[in-house]
């Protein structure tokens, strides 16, 4: 058992049929010695008496808020949550496995630039009695500060018969050094509590590996005189790190006909303009990637050819 | 470069960008493989990193690029020695068309651009001997290449920025 926060405790349980559970000692936070009784949750049933109580916790019915009373007055509370371990593996019932980029990916994180700011998100089908808290640091043995904001419900989607909820959090490294080579990874730890179930999820990454630039902006087409060709140009996204002579992007461009089956020629360039043949009803698209490190490509920015 | 002269920024830019391409072709899936393990915080200390105080940021380069260039050169020599060691030459053998050979040569080329013959800066010691098991060697190769990708990315940014803003 360990203290999650004041008066909230997590009981770690090996979860299998007829498991003996854990014996947990509760002490009433009062100078009183006599006439103390204990109840669990809203049930008024007195389960024990005395300043100290030893309870066997082996299932969710044993978790909840234990309150000690004297003469009808509540003296103190202890909320017990359960953290299940099945076959040596901590439960992951609350969050959905996003399976990208690999199985058992519950947290996904992205950064738009090298400023030390990043966003993490996760998915669940649970809609009520759910709370999250997030901590983050750079490195674990001698952690450096990362400050995370409040967790927000960022999207709701219908998936077949189920509703899926996406939660996200934004974090910022306290002393980011965008130009340096990261030596220690960022660690993100999410505590999830659903009713009386506690779970924790972690992710470890370098900012450089989660970079995904915003799409290029200001796509423009300029037809060339007496030619089927057009000059296309675009700009670095506003959110990308500066100066661009240092934090450079590379681009992938393509012209896509109306039919998805039509062959697309992709061209890679470090410039912010190109000359392409852009037929009527086609569209021109461009995406960006860090020029020197193969992290994710941005989403496509597109503009119709006509 | 030693003694304060400027490097051939444009040449360094080209070669460092080529190094980036080679490092990724030598181990393309690095971004999707989680090779970090318990204790990695300690093992990464052997490798020279371009750190915050090394003056490799745009402002630091403008003030005095020598500190940064010296750090980059130390790293290049370190990785060049690693790629020439039995970590890479031992079993399992690299494929004949492996880019590691080109990567090795390019590391040497760039380090020489930063230090013409006759000048000698102190360099770090080659790391401890390589592991004996082939599977351990393979894992170490991946870790080294992953770390090299991060190192050459910063070096390439430095030379791109230098070529754009510091060239005479």
């Amino acid at each position: 058992i360990w203290e999650l926060k004041k008066d909230v405790y997590v009981v770690e349980l090996d979860w299998y049929p007829d498991a003996p559970g854990e014996m947990v000692v509760l002490t009433c936070d009062t100078p009183e010695e006599d006439g103390i009784t204990w109840t669990l949750d809203q049930s008024g049933e007195v389960l024990g008496s005395g300043k100290t109580l030893t309870i066997q916790v082996k299932e969710f019915g044993d978790a909840g808020q234990y309150t000690c009373h004297k003469g009808g007055e509540a003296l103190s509370h202890s909320l017990l949550l359960l953290h299940k371990k099945e076959d040596g593996i901590w439960s992951t019932d609350v969050l959905k496995d996003q399976k990208e980029p690999k199985n058992k990916t519950f947290l996904r994180c992205e950064a738009k630039n090298y400023s030390g700011r990043f966003t993490c998100w996760w998915l669940t089908t649970i809609s009520t009695d759910l709370t999250f808290s997030v901590k983050s640091s750079r490195g674990s043995s001698n952690p450096q500060g990362v400050t995370c904001g409040a967790v927000t419900l960022s999207a709701e989607r219908v998936r077949g018969d189920n509703k899926e909820y996406e939660y996200s959090v934004e974090c910022q490294e306290d002393s980011a050094c965008p130009a340096a080579e990261e030596r220690l990874p960022i660690e993100v730890m999410v505590d999830a509590i659903h009713k009386l179930k506690y779970e924790n999820y972690t992710s470890s990454f370098f900012i450089r590996d989660i970079i995904k630039p915003d799409p290029p902006k200001n796509l423009q087409l300029k037809p060339l005189k007496n030619s089927r060709q057009v000059e296309v140009s675009w700009e670095y996204p506003d959110t990308w790190s500066t100066p661009h002579s240092y934090f450079s992007l590379t681009f992938c461009i393509q012209v896509q006909g109306k039919s998805k089956r039509e062959k697309k020629d992709r061209i890679f360039t470090d410039k912010t303009s190109a000359t392409v043949i852009c037929r009527k009803n086609a569209s021109f698209s461009v995406q960006a990637q860090d020029r020197y490190y193969s992290s994710s490509w941005s989403e496509w920015a597109s503009v119709p050819c006509s | 470069v030693p003694g304060g002269s400027s490097p051939a920024w444009a040449q360094c830019q080209q070669l460092s960008q080529k190094l980036c391409t080679l490092a990724w072709s030598a181990h393309p899936l690095v971004g999707h493989m989680d090779l970090r393990e318990e204790g990695d915080e300690e093992t990464t200390n052997d490798v020279p990193h371009i750190q915050c105080g090394d003056g490799c940021d745009p402002q630091g380069l403008r003030d005095n690029s020598q500190f940064c260039l010296q750090r980059i050169r130390q790293g290049l020599i370190f990785y060049e020695k690693l790629l020439g060691s039995d970590i890479f030459t031992g079993e399992p053998s690299l494929l004949p068309d492996s880019p590691v050979g080109q990567l090795h040569a390019s590391l040497l080329g760039l380090s020489q651009l930063l230090q013409p013959e006759g000048h000698h800066w102190e360099t770090q010691q080659i790391p401890s001997p390589s592991p004996s098991q082939p599977w351990q060697r393979l894992l170490l190769r991946f870790k080294i290449l992953r770390s090299l990708q991060a190192f050459v990315a910063v070096a390439a940014r430095v030379f791109a920025h230098g070529a754009a803003t510091l060239s005479p």
Epitope: L47, K58, E59, D62 | -
Partner: nanobody, 114 residues
Framework: EVQLVESGGGLVQPGGSLRLSCAAS????????MFWLRQAPGKGLEWLST???????IYPGSGKGRFTISRDNAKNTLYLQINNLKPEDTALYYC????????RGQGTQVTVSS
């Protein structure tokens, strides 16, 4: 009508053990929280242990000590195992449906003496 019948008491030497039983009827035993209480001569009721329908147990103090509560829902029976008996364990032992003993049996006498 609720009936609780305790048995298993008797005269025991110090250091000995006893297993008390309580046969329950007239209510849904398998879904009830059950208690063992005792009353020593000239003293008030003392709570010894609690067991929930699932078999999870609750004891006073910081450990179950010499007392072990258990139940068999199939037999509608509650048990109390007492080890290393001491003279001060001499008392009337009751099983009950509440900690105050408002619904309890007639009790079974345990006497510890050499």
């Amino acid at each position: 009508e609720v009936q609780l019948v305790e048995s298993g008491g008797g005269l025991v030497q110090p250091g000995g053990s006893l297993r008390l039983s309580c046969a329950a009827s007239g209510f849904t035993f398998s879904s009830s929280v059950m208690f063992w209480l005792r009353q020593a001569p000239g003293k008030g009721l003392e709570w010894l242990s609690t067991i929930k329908p699932t078999g999870s147990t609750i004891y006073p103090g910081s450990g179950k000590g010499r007392f072990t509560i258990s139940r068999d829902n199939a037999k509608n029976t509650l048990y109390l195992q007492i080890n290393n008996l001491k003279p001060e364990d001499t008392a009337l032992y009751y099983c009950a449906r509440d900690i105050g003993g408002t619904v309890r049996g007639q009790g079974t006498q345990v006497t510890v003496s050499s």
